[in-house]
């Protein structure tokens, strides 16, 4: 492999390690981490690209566990808050064997070649130039890391335009008890939009390491039902919003809208009485056609917490129920940034609504 | 200019082995993956295997997975597809190919197999 | 195993035609996949990579889109030399990285 690009490579370097990444990350900077799986000590190792050496800023933890079968864990940690993991649940790693393992910086994401195979692709949650610092850590032996510059440098869009496409994989909440919110979690990319963390709990400390809309407060312990605020920018592609709370134990039903004006661009309805999860578009007050397909059984059950992450994609929703890949909708009113208000009512309580 | 040439194909017995070579020139081995892939006779592809020089890692398809071995020799810049325990569905042409290069030009992954060799014909029968 | 279903396994098609052939993946492939063309007696040959990025040296006839799983091979005007069989590919780390669709042969009406 040809070191080429104006960083000259780490090699050999002691593990733990970190190390400057020079001038930041860049679109189409790739980064090679070439090593060896130790065979004892140890179940994890950890690739991080963050900013500074102290660790509470990790734009992209890459974290492979042999642990349960093997798994590979990406994050992001922010003002020491980490927020929710994706898994990868094949695991391209073997222990005592060595790898090559790239990451390639693009705009809207980090690629993860693992021995010549896109293993994953993990979109930013906060922007990429932040980071500054690689560092390596846990059951691995480091023969070199390498960088190779792009030719050119474009400048960052302001929206990411690539589709998310990597199942979402949080970690499984503890069913039966209620949730406290999780941490500080994603900012989005796009720099001229931002993240508003909706939030029952006491004032907390500073949020966001640059200035940001102040998230909302509510005097009580959980939401005013039916929940109504405004989307700041609308959706776009990349875009995320999450809610948590606890379904009632004598419930019925409850919705999570969308709304574009007095249209309802996206309607996620878990219905208890028809054990189904409904969706649908309401436009001039008519409803189109219902999608009801699962791949699972119905993941929301009475009386217990739940955790929904809702992605816009270029092409669709992607919705993701306690952490799990649940179902795509496809865009039925395209006009993106117009759909910037989302409604929740019904048989539940929130506990956390950041869009 | 990149080339690949297969060859070590041939009729082979049931229960029998066979070693094929896919011998790379205008690029090295250890900078790309190499694949096999095999096509049986009026049928669609099928992946076999694949090596990554570079760190030495290889994956199977289910099917050959215990019976089949891949290899690479980076200084013949040639990989190899060691064949054991030979059955009659095993018959088809072989090929290899190489597998996602990075275009600096462009900062993208060749995210496909870019060059592939004429093939050579495995046939396992009594 | 991510699955690639093909569709259609045939088709005739005349010169001219617009012709469009459908992959979709069992599950999120990201944009990993590639589409192939083959002619009898000859090996594979790389038409777009990436889902969408046209391969050097292809006419630009040929392109590639994806919509979610579901990923689409067109040919904007049928040239009496496309007449083969093609394939589309995924290359997602899985339990086997690497799955063809079941081909779909372009034949002439």
């Known amino acids: 492999m040809a070191f080429s690009g104006s960083q000259a490579p780490y090699l050999s370097p002691a593990v733990p390690f970190s190390g400057t990444i020079q001038g930041g990350l860049q679109d189409g900077l790739q980064i090679t981490v070439n090593g060896t799986v130790l065979s004892s000590s140890g179940t994890r190792f950890a690739v991080n690209f963050q900013t500074g050496f102290s660790g509470n800023d990790i734009a992209f933890h890459f974290n492979p566990r042999f642990e349960d079968g093997g798994y590979v864990v990406c994050n992001t940690r922010q003002n020491g808050s980490w927020g929710p993991e994706e898994r990868k649940t094949h695991m391209p790693f073997q222990k005592g064997m060595p790898f090559d393992l790239c990451f390639l910086v693009q705009s809207s994401d980090f690629k993860v070649m693992v021995n010549g195979i896109l293993f994953v692709q993990y979109f930013h949650r906060v922007p990429f130039h932040r980071v500054d610092t690689i560092s390596v850590n846990g059951s691995v032996q480091l023969s070199y890391i390498s960088f190779q510059n792009p030719r050119t440098v474009p400048v960052q869009p302001a929206f990411s335009t690539v589709p998310f496409s990597q199942p979402v994989c949080f970690p499984p909440r503890p069913r039966g008890r209620r949730q406290k919110p999780p941490g500080v979690w994603p900012a989005n990319p796009a720099p001229i939009t931002q993240t508003v963390i909706h939030t029952v709990q006491s004032a907390p400390g500073q949020m966001f390491s640059t200035p940001a809309i102040p998230p909302m407060m509510y005097p009580h312990p959980a939401y005013p039902m039916p929940f109504i605020t405004t989307i700041l920018g609308g959706l776009y592609p990349s875009k995320s919003i999450l809610l948590s709370g606890t379904v009632l134990p004598s419930a019925q039903r409850f919705h999570i809208n969308l709304c574009s004006g007095n249209h309802i661009a996206f309607h996620l309805n878990p219905r208890f009485d028809e054990n189904a999860v409904v969706r649908n578009t309401q436009i001039d007050n008519s409803w189109g056609s219902e999608e009801r397909s699962l791949p699972r059984k119905m993941p929301f059950v009475r009386g217990q917490s739940f955790s929904v992450w809702i992605l816009c994609e270029a092409h669709c929703l992607k919705v993701a129920v306690d952490g799990q890949h649940l179902f795509e909708y496809y865009h039925r009113l395209r006009n993106l940034p117009t759909i910037n208000r989302l409604e929740v009512g019904g048989d539940i309580q929130l506990t956390h609504v950041q869009t | 200019e990149v080339q690949l040439v297969e060859s070590g194909g041939g009729l082979v017995q049931p229960g029998g082995s066979l070693r094929l070579s896919c011998a790379a020139s205008?690029?090295?081995?250890?900078?790309?993956?190499i694949h096999w892939v095999r096509q049986a006779p009026g049928k669609g592809l099928e992946w076999v295997a694949y090596?990554?020089?570079?760190?030495?890692?290889?994956s199977y398809a289910d099917s050959v997975k215990g019976r089949f071995t891949i290899s690479a020799d980076t200084s013949k810049n040639t990989a190899y597809l060691q064949m054991n325990s030979l059955r009659a569905e095993d018959t088809a042409v072989y090929y290899c190919?190489?597998?996602?290069?990075?275009?600096?030009?462009?900062?993208?992954?060749?995210?496909?197999?870019?060059?592939w060799g004429q093939g050579t014909l495995v046939t396992v029968s009594s | 195993d991510i699955q690639m279903t093909q569709s259609p396994s045939s088709l005739s098609a005349s010169v001219g035609d617009r012709v469009t052939i459908t992959c979709r993946a069992s599950?999120?492939?990201?944009?990993?996949v590639a589409w192939y063309q083959q002619k009898p007696g000859k090996a594979p040959k790389l038409l777009i990579y990436?889902?969408?990025s046209l391969y050097s040296g292809v006419p630009s006839r040929f392109s590639g889109s994806r919509s979610g799983t579901d990923f689409t091979l067109t040919i904007s005007s049928l040239q009496p030399e496309d007449f083969a069989t093609y394939y589309c590919?995924?290359?997602?780390?899985?339990?086997?990285?690497?799955?063809f669709g079941q081909g779909t042969k372009v034949e002439i009406k």
């Open positions: 590919q995924q290359s997602y780390y899985d339990s086997n990285p690497i799955t």
């Open positions: 990436s889902a969408s």
């Open positions: 205008g690029f090295t081995v250890s900078s790309s993956s």
């Open positions: 599950q999120s492939v990201s944009s990993a």
């Open positions: 090596i990554y020089p570079y760190s030495g890692y290889t």
């Open positions: 190919a190489r597998y996602s290069t990075y275009s600096s030009s462009s900062s993208k992954w060749v995210w496909g197999m870019d060059y």
